[in-house]
Interface confidence: low
């Protein structure tokens, strides 16, 4: 058993039929010695008396809020949560496996630049009685500070018969060094509690590996005289690290016909303009990627050829 | 050229060669995200790799103040990786394919280090750790780890030279 936060404890249980469970001793936080009784949740049934209560925790029915009283007055509470371990593996029932970029990916994180700011998100089908707490650091043996905000519900989607909820959190490295080569990964730890079930999820990454620039901005077309060619121009996204002479992007320009089956023409360039042939009913799209490190491409910015 | 006394390197040449290094490092090991190498007990292999760190003056302000700190660190790293790529980690079994970019990568590391430090000048270099894996699969894993680490190193070096070429060239 360990303390998650004040008056909230996690009991770790090996979860299999007829498992013996864990013996837990609760102590009433009071100077009083006599006349103390214990109850569980909203029940008025007295479970025991005295300053300490010993219980055998085997299943979710044994978890919950234990309260000690004296003469009708509440003295203190202890909330017991369960963390299940099945076949040596901690349960992952609360969050959905996103399977990208690989199986058992519960947390996904992205950064728009090298400032040390990043966003992580996760999915669940659970809509109520759900709380999340996020902690992060750079490195684990000698951790350096990363500050995370509160997790918030950022999207709701309908998937078949089910609703899926996306939660996200923003974190910022306290003393980021955008120009340095990271040698210690960022660690992100999410505590998830659903009713009386506790689970924890972790992710470990370098900012450089989760970079995904915003799409290029101000995408414009300038027709070239007496030609089907156009000059496409664009700018670096506002959110990208500066100076651009140091934090450079490379770009992919694509001409795409109306039909997905039509051949796509692609040009790669380090400049912020390119000359392409504009076909009727086609659109021109541009996306960006870090010039020197192959992390994710941005989403496309697009304009119609007409 | 970045001689220890402090004159400027050939920023544009260094920029071109470092950008080529980035391309080669990624073509030598394009598997981004498919193999989480950090789960494979990194400590002994990557602790000793020279990283370009916050205090090395490789940020735009540091380069403007005095690029020597940074260039010395980059040179140190280039020599380190050049030695690693020439060691039995890469020359031993399993043999690299004849068209493997590792050979070109090795030559380009040497080329850039020579651009930074002409013959006869000596910056102190970091000792290469004695990593001699006995099993071919260990060697393969180590190659991947070294190439992943090199990708990060040359990305920072390329940024430095691109910025130098744009703002510090005479």
């Amino acid at each position: 058993i360990w303390e998650l936060k004040k008056d909230v404890y996690v009991v770790e249980l090996d979860w299999y039929p007829d498992a013996p469970g864990e013996m837990v001793v609760l102590t009433c936080d009071t100077p009083e010695e006599d006349g103390i009784t214990w109850t569980l949740d909203q029940s008025s049934e007295v479970l025991g008396s005295g300053k300490t209560l010993t219980i055998q925790v085997k299943e979710f029915g044994d978890a919950g809020q234990y309260t000690c009283h004296k003469g009708g007055e509440v003295l203190s509470h202890s909330l017991l949560l369960l963390h299940k371990k099945e076949d040596g593996i901690w349960s992952t029932d609360i969050l959905k496996d996103q399977k990208e970029p690989k199986n058992k990916t519960f947390l996904r994180c992205e950064a728009k630049n090298y400032s040390g700011r990043f966003t992580c998100w996760w999915l669940t089908t659970i809509s109520t009685d759900l709380t999340f707490s996020v902690k992060s650091s750079r490195g684990s043996s000698d951790p350096q500070g990363v500050t995370c905000g509160a997790a918030t519900l950022s999207a709701e989607r309908v998937r078949g018969d089910n609703k899926e909820y996306e939660y996200s959190v923003e974190c910022q490295e306290d003393s980021a060094c955008p120009a340095a080569e990271e040698s210690l990964p960022i660690e992100v730890m999410v505590d998830a509690v659903h009713k009386l079930k506790y689970e924890n999820y972790t992710s470990s990454f370098f900012i450089r590996d989760i970079i995904k620039p915003d799409p290029p901005k101000n995408l414009q077309l300038k027709p070239l005289k007496n030609s089907r060619q156009v000059e496409v121009s664009w700018e670096y996204p506002d959110t990208w690290s500066t100076p651009h002479s140091y934090f450079s992007l490379t770009f992919c320009v694509q001409v795409q016909g109306k039909s997905k089956r039509e051949k796509k023409d692609r040009v790669f360039t380090d400049k912020t303009s390119a000359t392409v042939i504009c076909r009727k009913n086609a659109s021109i799209s541009v996306r960006a990627q870090d010039r020197y490190y192959s992390s994710s491409w941005s989403e496309w910015a697009s304009v119609p050829c007409s | 050229r970045a001689v220890p006394g402090g004159s400027s390197p050939a920023w544009t040449q260094c920029q071109q060669l470092s950008q080529k290094l980035c391309t080669l490092a990624w073509s030598a090991h394009p598997l981004v995200g498919h193999m989480d190498l950090r789960e494979e007990g990194d400590e002994e292999t990557t602790n000793d790799v020279p990283h370009i760190q916050c205090g090395d003056g490789c940020d735009p302000q540091g380069l403007r103040d005095n690029s020597q700190f940074c260039l010395q660190r980059i040179h140190q790293g280039l020599i380190f990786y050049e030695k690693l790529l020439g060691s039995d980690i890469f020359t031993g079994e399993p043999s690299l394919l004849p068209d493997s970019p590792v050979g070109q990568l090795h030559a380009s590391l040497l080329g850039l280090s020579q651009l930074l430090q002409p013959e006869g000048h000596h910056w102190e270099t970091q000792q290469i750790p004695s990593l001699s894996p006995s099993q071919p699969w260990q060697r393969l894993l180590l190659r991947f780890k070294i190439l992943r680490s090199l990708q990060a190193f040359v990305a920072v070096a390329a940024r430095v030279f691109a910025h130098g070429a744009a703002t510090l060239s005479p």
Partner: nanobody
Framework: QLQLVESGGGLVQPGGSLRLSCVAS????????MAWYRQRPGKERELVGS????????HYVDAVKGRFTISRDNAKNTVYLQMNVLKPEDTAVYYC????????????WGQGTQVTVSS
Amino acid sequence: QLQLVESGGGLVQPGGSLRLSCVASGFAFSTYAMAWYRQRPGKERELVGSIDSSGDNTHYVDAVKGRFTISRDNAKNTVYLQMNVLKPEDTAVYYCNSPNTGWGTRRYWGQGTQVTVSS
């Protein structure tokens, strides 16, 4: 060779003040964010607060907010920790270092300076 030398510690009464200094050498100090750490008796080393390379931004842990101030003088390669309204629980050995990725994963630490708050 990298060196961090902390000084200014001593015995002080609760409510008193101290100013710690840390002189750094062997690296480009002005491009590093720096931080103060402390190790209380029987506890692990913990962050007190940090300051960015320019000195414009500082960050403090809740336990010292409003009482401690970190500043730096890049011309002197020195970072300072001004400690006011000291409490007995501030008793510790204080160290300075970079709060970033250290120097590789093996970090170099100075000898620290002892601060004792007691009546």
